[in-house]
Amino acid sequence: ESGYAQNGDLEDAELDDYSFSCYSQLEVNGSQHSLTCAFEDPDVNTTNLEFEICGALVEVKCLSFRKLQEIYFIETKKFLLIGKSNICVKVGGKSLTCKKIDLTTIVKPEAPFDLSVIYREGANDFVVTFNTSHLQKKYVKVLMHDVAYRQEKDENKWMHVNLSSTKLTLLQRNLQPEAMYEIKVRSIPDHYFKGFWSEWSPSYYFRTPEINNSPGEMDP
């Protein structure tokens, strides 16, 4: 594998200035997959810098990324999805730094959407539902979801619930009465595919009802 140092002492002898990270999204546009890379240092001068991916591709040896402001992007059907690809930062055809990456280990799901909360008076609970485009996908179908909610006044006091379905029940007794709550959800791959949390869904806001005391009951 040309371009690689041959031993452990030299293995990281690359230009740290050009360190980058990438994520993949499978079937993000019909059957097209995408790969997005960006430099970790936002101050890198990206003029004349290019990204290229080689290996673990169908029908082609290498593909070049398109540059969109400060990110580099490919949309293609040509990912083999098995084996490691070599992703390189290049200038004038010369590699500055490269990473071997298996695209199935850097998957970032699409954000969940249509989050809503319905109060069930009889059951004294809140039914949280949301949707995900991954239910329709053929590859990254199995996700773990992270539902986060907080009382609006408690800025950093988020409660988290992990679930694999798209429906969650919150018991009224576990929430403060007459309070405004914010809730949001994100997803991460959970079967074979590995990677990163999606972006958060748009937040949904709901108010809890006041406590209805039965006749004869006293306020505490």
């Epitope: 594998e1 690689y4 293995e11 999805l81 098995i82 084996g83 590859y139």
Partner: antibody, heavy 118, light 111 residues
């Protein structure tokens, strides 16, 4: 060229431990996970576990968990497999193998014979 | 654990003839078009050698008389025209789920 070179044959007594090494060369050590595969005499292949030299993260076959430890030394591009509480059934050839992708093995060491005998 | 069943256990084929080895898994090892099945060749006294990865992708340097096919739970390794140097034991392996398991092996000999 890409090579995995393993340490030499070992003879051990039941209850003892053995530590086998696998030195990688010809590629950037942290780019590929390295795994260990067991082959008992006249038998098939059995995956023991693997290690990611970049992070030191490991994955072990439940069957060997508690008895196997995999480590890596980036300074020498070497991975190690230690197997403890040896028994006669551990007599086998142990191969280290590079994972070209998740999880197939594109480069193999020459094998290390471990004999467990009282 | 996913159980890998290879058939036949052994196979005698004339030089130049086709050899076909099957591997059946106890559950699917495919995710849509991603087939997590691989094939190895092992000659006596040598380590295994990767032939096919992802069910049908030929490893670099492997002669194109070797081919793989299949999806789900049923996979096949084919040697289109058996050569003397192909005498070996062949193993299938799945990588969809830990522990990554191998078939019991198929011994290919010259008839």
């Amino acid at each position: 060229q890409v090579q995995l070179v393993q340490s030499g044959a070992e003879v051990k007594k039941p209850g003892a431990s053995v530590k086998v090494s696998c030195k990688a060369s010809g590629y950037r050590f942290t780019d590929y996970e390295l795994h260990w595969v067991k082959q008992a005499p006249g038998q098939g292949l059995e995956w023991i576990g693997g290690i990611d030299p970049k992070t030191g993260g490991t994955a072990y076959n439940q069957k060997f968990k508690g008895r196997v430890t995999m480590t890596s030394d980036r300074s020498t591009s070497t991975v190690y497999m230690e197997l403890s509480s040896l028994r006669s059934e551990d007599t086998a050839v142990y191969y280290c193998a590079r994972s070209g992708g998740r999880w197939y093995f594109d480069v193999w060491g020459q094998g290390t014979t471990v004999t467990v005998s009282s | 654990d996913i159980v890998m069943t290879q058939s036949p256990d052994s196979l005698a084929v004339s030089l130049g003839e086709r050899a076909t080895i099957n591997c059946r898994t106890s559950e699917s090892v495919s995710i849509h078009l991603l087939h997590l099945m691989h094939w190895y060749q092992q000659k006596p006294g040598q380590p295994p050698k990767l032939l096919i990865y992802g069910a049908s992708n030929l490893e670099s340097g492997v002669p194109d008389r070797f081919s793989g096919s299949g999806s789900g739970t049923d996979f096949t390794l084919t040697i289109s025209s058996l050569q003397a140097e192909d005498v070996a034991v062949y193993y299938c392996q799945q990588s969809i789920k830990d522990p990554y398991t191998f078939g019991g092996g198929t011994k290919v000999e010259i008839k």
